[in-house]
Structure formats: structure tokens, C-alpha cells
């Protein structure tokens, strides 16, 4: 449906606050290093605009394109050259290749000072006296780190982080009260972030099918009820709408978000038994509400998958017809019968599927050629079954730290030339899997472990994009969207690495490690782990866990030490000593 | 537990081929991989086939001369050596591991290949 003004559509559907939330998020994900007052200033310019165009959508400029408009303004910041180098040649160039731009030149690790939350009391009186700047600062922090949070989503944070304040300045105890809801959202909004970097590399590296693929796999495992039909609709109208995200048109985004979400509460009979309570709640928590819902059951009496697609003599007639749709019948009903399969499992079967097809329905006898098709998934089905009955069972053996430096060792073997922080960061992450998924039952952990396992690598392989310094991680981030985890799972030690020069430095501790959370503290630990497999990647298991028991011994007595500084300057050479004995450095 | 039985070692003329089997009994394996050892050096990883999906490692030293496969209908492992060098000669092991650690768990007796000049 065309408009005379798309600014002027966009500002009316959404309303003047959500407008203005959309255009900063949009704002700041482009330029990550402008000041908050710049992007302040640039997007209440454009609402002003905006405005002119809802009162007359004649008016001038109002017909131009979004991308149009938000790129001129983009291109009024006067240091854009200076911050951002050649960022600025964007603006030399037209749409729509001034956006495509800029959105290559967005950062996954752009180099901003950690934010450092401020006393309870400090946060409070700033809330307190200017509750809109303060909500927009949060906006704009979280946006310019996470240039690829879902934009809609981040509206529903913001809601919840005002929500918290709200209430918590008021308490008795604010710490007590505030503290615990702003640690649940910052690591739901970290979680949120992954998944949506996925989303936007399934698009942005895989295409547009290979992301439908994975739709259609999640939608039939949580709708399994809901036709085949509807299943493809529902596909259609989200890939619109995470393309539109991923590609910085973050006000059609949202718009098109509200109609999907208003589609399903009208279509619930012929959706979901499960989306009743989703479906009653305002539009920010309804849309997180129905992107979060559990799988319904599935219907009774399935019939087996094999009349359709091996007993039937029309498999090849169906196939050759509609390629396509009929893979993505394949992938709906196998999905809707598997809840308890990963993701990227089913789309491993359906490719497995159509592999077989492609080379059976070109042969003499067809049938005869694939009858034996789903034999071929049983081994496909156990790998990341026997993975993550190892891998749980290891988690339980060892807690999360240690489990986490299991992983830490095992990843810097494989990819030691990855720098240390993403080696730390996303091992840890890795590591999470055994808290997050191991208590499931059976039926729940592989969906629940391999899904999100492939959320963490791809972690790994954006940020290995921006640098990159392994051959074998680009191979395993870009053959295969969904046998990125096999291939790690794979890899050797790294037989061609260079061990790295021995430098003390790295390896001498001072007396503020014992005034950082434990959480601070064990990165310290694990950001030396890493370093010493880099100077040593030969070394056992059993010589890096007794040299790192030794470390904590010696952390933990020092801490406790009259004079720490002294003891951490004395007991640490004595450690260092020791552990270059130990593993012959 | 892991089985595992190599055999096709034997002497051959450098620029020659060969080709060495591994039959794996008892539990499927994740990876399986060969290594070799000559006299006075260390173990060698040599290279590597996972057993799902054939993902294949090879050290640089032998990349473009040998190759490995695997044939699960017989749970054999091969490794067909072409272009062959007198610094090929060695001890070859084949080997498994049962999960994602790059060790190995599981390791043959080893058989012999020696590349004359």
C-alpha cells in the first residue's frame, strides 16, 4: 500500500514515542561512537520533520525514502570523517547503496568504555529528575553496543527498565529491590542480542532461504497444530520483518512486528491452544510474549512421515514440481512431529533429504534409490545426542567454572590464534549450555543445547569477521550455517600454530584482583588459562588443571594476606617459577 | 571401549602409493585419525575424519598427497597415501576420540611404512 509520505505513514502507526525510541535505536546502531546530545539533536530534528509531513504529506522532501532521510541527516554530523573514517565515503554515494554502507561498516566490538552501573541512590535522583533522558540514554548505550538488537525488543526492555525504576526507587530497600531486575534484564538482553545477530547473519550470510528454512523448522515445532499453509504465511511474515531489522528499517520493522502479532491473536484457533494469555497483554509484551511461547501439543495420530516421503510413488513428480514447497512440507511435518530435536538438526535431515533426492530422481530407479533415505538420519540424530550426554555429564562432574575452562582449553587448542578476550567470552558462554540446558529432561536438552550452542559460535565467527585470523574458523563459519558445530566439534590442535613468547607480564597478579566479583575474578583466571595454552598448547589436562589449582591457592591466600601487594609480588614469581617447571616453558 | 586394527603399512619406492586400513570394533567414534612416529621424533598428527559428517583435518605436511575417507557400512577408516617420501617413513597409528577434546582416547598397535630412495 503506497503512501504519498512514508515518514508520515510510519510516525502515525506508531505514535510519536515509539517513533522517536525507533529513530535513536536506528541512530545509534549507524554511528556508534556520537555522543547521546548528538543523536539527541539529530533525532528530534527528524521528528520535527515528520511532523510537518503527518500535518501535509505534500510538503517538501516528505515523499523521499526513509534510507533518503535518515542518511542525509546521518551525514550532517561534521566528525564523521575524523570518528569514524572511511565511514564517510558512504555519504558520497546514493541510495541504496549509501545504506548497504553503512550497515557494513556497523561494529560487533566497537571500542566503548564498559558501562559501569552507578550507586542505587545516583540512579534514582537521575531518574527521578529527567525520567525521559534517562530512558533514552539507556536506548542509545544499549543500541550503539548492540548494533543488531531487535529493534522492537529493545522497546520492551526500555519498558521494563522504567518499570523497575518506577517501582525500586520507591521501595525501602531500593539496592535490594533494583539490583536483581537490572542484572535479569542485562543478561536476557545479552541473550536477546545473540539471537538476533544470528537471525541477521542467517539473512545477511545464507540468504533468504536459508533463514525462511529455519523459521519453518521453529514455527511447525511450536505450532504444530497450525496447517501447513498458515506455518508458510506466518514464514513469510517474519522473514519480512527480521530482513527489515537486519537491514536498519527499524520503523517498518516494528509496524510490520504489531500486524504479525495482531495476525496471530485473530488466527489463534488455527495457530496455537497456547497463545490465549500472550494474546491479552499490551502490544510490546504480546509480541515478546508470542516469540517466547512453548510448543503446543502436538496433534494425535500423526501418520508416519514415510508414505509421503518414501512409500509414495510420486515423490519425485511432487519434488520436481515444486522443489521448494515440497522441502518445506518435508521440513514442517518432520519438525511438527520432533519437538525434541535442535533446529539445526531438522534443516541437517531436510538438507540430508534433499541431497538424496536430487541425485535418486535422476537415476534409473528412483524409489529403489532413496528407500533408504531415513536410515541415513539416524547417525545424524545421535551425534549431537551422544555430544551433549558427554558434554552434560562432564558439566555435572565439574560445576560451571570449570566446565567453562574444560571448554576454554579445548577451544584455544583448536583456534589459538583467536584473541583472548573472544576466547574467553565465548567459551564462558559455551559453558553456560550446562546450567542452561543439562537440567532438562531427555526430551528438551538437545533443542535446547545445540540451538543455543549455535547462537554462541556464531558469536565467535562475527567477531572473527571483524579480524580475521584463522583459516579454520572461516571455514567453519562459512561452509555450513548449520554444521557450524560439527565443524568445531571436528577440528584438531592447531599443528601449524607457533607457540607464543613466555612474557611474565601476563602472569603477575596484583592485590585488586581480590576487590573484583567473583565473576571478574574468574575471567581474570580464565584470560590466564588461555594465555598459558597459547604458550603451551601441548601441554595435558592434568599439568594446566594442577598448574591452575596452584593459581587459585595462591590468589585466595594472598587475598587474605596483611600486606597482599607484597605477597602477590613475592608468591607470584615463586608461582610463575613453578609452573614453567612444571609444563617446561 | 574403541577396537581398532590397522593394516596396509609396507615398503614402497619414493613417489610411490600406498594405502592404510583401520577397522573400528565397539563403539562408534567421534573422530578417527591417523598419526605416525619415526624413529627418534615425536607422534605426528597426520590427519583426521569425523565420522558423522566427514569433516577432514590434514597436518600441512602431507596436504594434496594424501587423503582420508571412511566407509561406515564397514567402520574402516582409510587413509590413501600417494606421492610418497622417505620422510613418510615411519611408525602410522590410527586413532579415535570419543567427543569434541582434540585427544585422542583410543589408539592401534601401529604398522610400518618405509619409503625408499
Known amino acids: 500500500d503506497a503512501h504519498k509520505s512514508e515518514v508520515a505513514h510510519r510516525f502515525k502507526d506508531l505514535g510519536e514515542e515509539n517513533f522517536k525510541a525507533l529513530v535513536l535505536i536506528a541512530f545509534a546502531q549507524y554511528l556508534q561512537q556520537c555522543p547521546f546530545e548528538d543523536h539527541v539533536k539529530l533525532v528530534n530534528e527528524v521528528t520535527e520533520f515528520a511532523k510537518t509531513c503527518v500535518a501535509d504529506e505534500s510538503a517538501e522532501n516528505c515523499d523521499k525514502s526513509l534510507h533518503t532521510l535518515f542518511g542525509d541527516k546521518l551525514c550532517t554530523v561534521a566528525t564523521l570523517r575524523e570518528t569514524y573514517g572511511e565511514m564517510a565515503d558512504c555519504c558520497a554515494k546514493q541510495e541504496p547503496e549509501r545504506n548497504e554502507c553503512f550497515l557494513q561498516h556497523k561494529d560487533d566490538n566497537p571500542n566503548l568504555p564498559r558501562l559501569v552501573r552507578p550507586e542505587v541512590d545516583v540512579m534514582c535522583t537521575a531518574f527521578h529528575d529527567n525520567e525521559e533522558t534517562f530512558l533514552k540514554k539507556y536506548l542509545y548505550e544499549i543500541a550503539r553496543r548492540h548494533p543488531y538488537f531487535y529493534a522492537p525488543e529493545l522497546l520492551f526492555f526500555a519498558k521494563r527498565y522504567k518499570a523497575a525504576f518506577t517501582e525500586c526507587c520507591q521501595a525501602a530497600d531500593k539496592a535490594a529491590c533494583l539490583l536483581p531486575k537490572l542484572d535479569e534484564l542485562r543478561d536476557e538482553g545479552k541473550a536477546s542480542s545473540a539471537k538476533q545477530r544470528l537471525k541477521c547473519a542467517s539473512l545477511q550470510k545464507f540468504g533468504e532461504r536459508a533463514f525462511k528454512a529455519w523459521a519453518v523448522a521453529r514455527l511447525s515445532q511450536r505450532f504444530p497444530k497450525a496447517e501447513f499453509a498458515e506455518v508458510s504465511k506466518l514464514v513469510t511474515d517474519l522473514t519480512k520483518v527480521h530482513t527489515e531489522c537486519c537491514h536498519g528499517d527499524l520503523l517498518e520493522c516494528a509496524d510490520d512486528r504489531a500486524d504479525l502479532a495482531k495476525y496471530i491473536c485473530e488466527n489463534q484457533d488455527s495457530i496455537s491452544s497456547k497463545l490465549k494469555e500472550c494474546c491479552e497483554k499490551p502490544l510490546l509484551e504480546k509480541s515478546h510474549c508470542i516469540a517466547e511461547v512453548e510448543n503446543d501439543e502436538m496433534p494425535a495420530d500423526l501418520p508416519s512421515l514415510a508414505a509421503d516421503f518414501v512409500e509414495s510413488k510420486d515423490v519425485c513428480k511432487n519434488y520436481a514440481e515444486a522443489k521448494d514447497v515440497f522441502l518445506g512440507m518435508f521440513l514442517y511435518e518432520y519438525a511438527r512431529r520432533h519437538p525434541d530435536y535442535s533446529v539445526v538438526l531438522l534443516l541437517r535431515l531436510a538438507k540430508t533429504y534433499e541431497t538424496t533426492l536430487e541425485k535418486c530422481c535422476a537415476a534409473a530407479d528412483p524409489h529403489e534409490c532413496y528407500a533408504k533415505v531415513f536410515d541415513e538420519f539416524k547417525p545424524l540424530v545421535e551425534e549431537p545426542q551422544n555430544l551433549i550426554k558427554q558434554n552434560c555429564e562432564l558439566f555435572e562432574q565439574l560445576g560451571e567454572y570449570k566446565f567453562q575452562n574444560a571448554l576454554l582449553v579445548r577451544y584455544t587448542k583448536k583456534v589459538p590464534q583467536v584473541s583472548t578476550p573472544t576466547l574467553v567470552e565465548v567459551s564462558r558462554n559455551l559453558g553456560k549450555v550446562g546450567s542452561k540446558c543439562c537440567k532438562h529432561p531427555e526430551a528438551k536438552r538437545m533443542p535446547c543445547a545445540e540451538d543455543y550452542l549455535s547462537v554462541v559460535l556464531n558469536q565467535l565467527c562475527v567477531l572473527h569477521e571483524k579480524t580475521p585470523v584463522s583459516d579454520r574458523v572461516t571455514k567453519c563459519c562459512t561452509e555450513s550455517l548449520v554444521n557450524r558445530r560439527p565443524c568445531f566439534s571436528a577440528l584438531e590442535v592447531d599443528e601449524t600454530y607457533v607457540p607464543k613468547e613466555f612474557n611474565a607480564e601476563t602472569f603477575t597478579f596484583h592485590a585488586d584482583i581480590c576487590t573484583l566479583s567473583e565473576k571478574e575474578r574468574q575471567i581474570k583466571k580464565q584470560t590466564a588459562l588461555v594465555e598459558l595454552v597459547k604458550h603451551k598448547p601441548k601441554a595435558t589436562k592434568e599439568q594446566l588443571k594442577a598448574v591452575m589449582d596452584d593459581f587459585a591457592a595462591f590468589v585466595e591466600k594472598c587475598c587474605k594476606a596483611d600486606d597482599k601487594e607484597t605477597c602477590f609480588a613475592e608468591e607470584g614469581k615463586k608461582l610463575v617459577a613453578a609452573s614453567q617447571a612444571a609444563l617446561g616453558l | 571401549q574403541v577396537q581398532l586394527v590397522e593394516s596396509g603399512g609396507g615398503l614402497v619406492q619414493a613417489g610411490g602409493s600406498l594405502r592404510l586400513s583401520c577397522a573400528a570394533s565397539g563403539r562408534t567414534p567421534y573422530v578417527m585419525g591417523w598419526f605416525r612416529q619415526a624413529p627418534g621424533n615425536e607422534r605426528e598428527f597426520v590427519a583426521s575424519i569425523s565420522w558423522t559428517y566427514g569433516y577432514t583435518n590434514y597436518a600441512n605436511s602431507v596436504k594434496g598427497r594424501f587423503r582420508i575417507s571412511k566407509d561406515n557400512a564397514k567402520n574402516t577408516v582409510l587413509l590413501q597415501m600417494n606421492s610418497l617420501k622417505p620422510e613418510d617413513t615411519a611408525v602410522y597409528y590410527c586413532?579415535?576420540?570419543?567427543?569434541?577434546?582434540?585427544?585422542?582416547?583410543?589408539w592401534g598397535q601401529g604398522t610400518q611404512v618405509t619409503v625408499s630412495s
Open positions: 586413532a579415535a576420540r570419543r567427543g569434541e577434546d582434540p585427544e585422542y582416547d583410543y
